[in-house]
Interface confidence: low
């Protein structure tokens, strides 16, 4: 088992909104849960966009999930990752 590296980034979206993206990379096996949470609770499926779980050329995998949130509410949001029985929670950078 190779645990993922998780990286959270933010980018400007429309006025008053930002897009936050959570990337998991270099993990094996390919089964992973990656989701955005607000106040600790997973966001609705249709408010998130997921990338495919793709091989990254080193025998491991990568994927991402993104959502759009209101600027100023960043600290209510976290990216939750679960892989091979281990889990972690990742905040939006300020």
């Amino acid at each position: 088992t190779v645990p993922p590296m998780v990286n959270v980034t933010r980018s400007e979206a429309s006025e008053g909104n930002i897009t936050v993206t959570c990337r998991a990379s270099s993990f094996y096996p390919r089964n992973i849960i990656l989701t955005w949470r607000q106040d600790g609770v997973s966001l609705a499926h249709d408010t998130q966009q997921w990338g495919d779980v793709l091989p990254d050329g080193n025998g491991t995998y990568q994927t991402w999930v993104a959502t759009r949130i209101c600027r100023g509410e960043e600290q209510r949001f976290t990216c939750y990752m679960e892989h091979s029985g281990n889990h972690s929670t990742h905040p939006v950078p300020s």
Partner: antibody
Framework: QGQMQQSGAELVKPGASVKLSCKTS????????ISWLKQKPGQSLEWIAW????????SYNQKFTAKAQLTVDTSSSTAYMQFSSLTTEDSAIYYC???????????????WGQGTLVTVSA | DVLMTQTPLSLPVSLGDQASLSCRSS???????????LEWYLQKPGQSPKLLIY???NRFSGVPDRFSGSGSGTDFTLKISRVEAEDLGVYYC?????????FGGGTKVEIK
């Protein structure tokens, strides 16, 4: 599951403030949401607020926004709640509790501290 | 705020009986993500509450299978199939779908 150890009972005067602590062990503190709850003798429970230990982000029950302030100290894995401008109505047991969001489950108050009794009296 | 109403206030039982506790919310408590965050807690005298059921019907780890939760929308039920002495205490329902999260007033299960 870990442990949550709360500070001892407090006897305080009206108008004063009190800072309660909830020291945790046995789990990754910064991954967790900690809530504080109030229970007056013989009554039900009220949720006050939560704090996400990873960022210090908070969400309050509007009823308590002017009364409670939540903070964390990640170096000691301890959550704090400062309660201000105390009145006799604030006499209660205060609990800290840890949320459990492992996997696809979602349980709010999965693990509890033993509670701290606060008595407000002149 | 979502008002959680529990009935009955007190439920006298004989050991071995089935007990049924009711909880009604003042509005639908389906979260925006589609889950219903309805939980049941048991508080024994002088102790902290303990989580029994989460998301309506899921038993928390270590909770005996004599406890079962059901319901949807605004009406929820906790059943204890065969009441044991250790089950006596006050049961609270709780909704975590709408802020502020709120508890019911409690149902006290006691010996008849």
């Amino acid at each position: 599951q870990g442990q949550m150890q709360q500070s001892g009972a407090e006897l305080v005067k009206p108008g004063a403030s009190v800072k309660l602590s909830c020291k945790t062990s046995g789990f990754t503190f910064s991954d967790n949401y900690i809530s504080w709850l109030k229970q007056k003798p013989g009554q039900s429970l009220e949720w006050i607020a939560w704090i996400y230990a990873g960022t210090g982000g908070t969400s309050y029950n509007q009823k308590f926004t002017a009364k409670a302030q939540l903070t964390v100290d990640t170096s000691s894995s301890t959550a704090y709640m400062q309660f201000s401008s105390l009145t006799t109505e604030d006499s209660a047991i205060y609990y800290c509790a840890r949320h459990d969001y492992y996997g696809t489950s979602g349980a709010w108050f999965a693990y509890w501290g033993q509670g701290t009794l606060v008595t407000v009296s002149a | 705020d979502v008002l959680m109403t529990q009935t009955p206030l007190s439920l006298p039982v004989s050991l071995g009986d089935q007990a049924s506790l009711s909880c009604r919310s003042s509005q639908n408590i389906v979260h925006i993500n589609g889950n219903t965050y309805l939980e049941w807690y048991l508080q024994k005298p002088g102790q902290s509450p303990k989580l029994l059921i989460y998301k309506v019907s899921n038993r928390f780890s270590g909770v005996p299978d004599r406890f079962s939760g059901s319901g949807s929308g605004t009406d929820f039920t906790l059943k204890i199939s065969r009441v044991e002495a250790e089950d006596l205490g006050v049961y609270y329902c709780f909704q975590g779908s709408h802020v502020p999260w709120t508890f019911g007033g409690g149902t006290k299960v006691e010996i008849k």
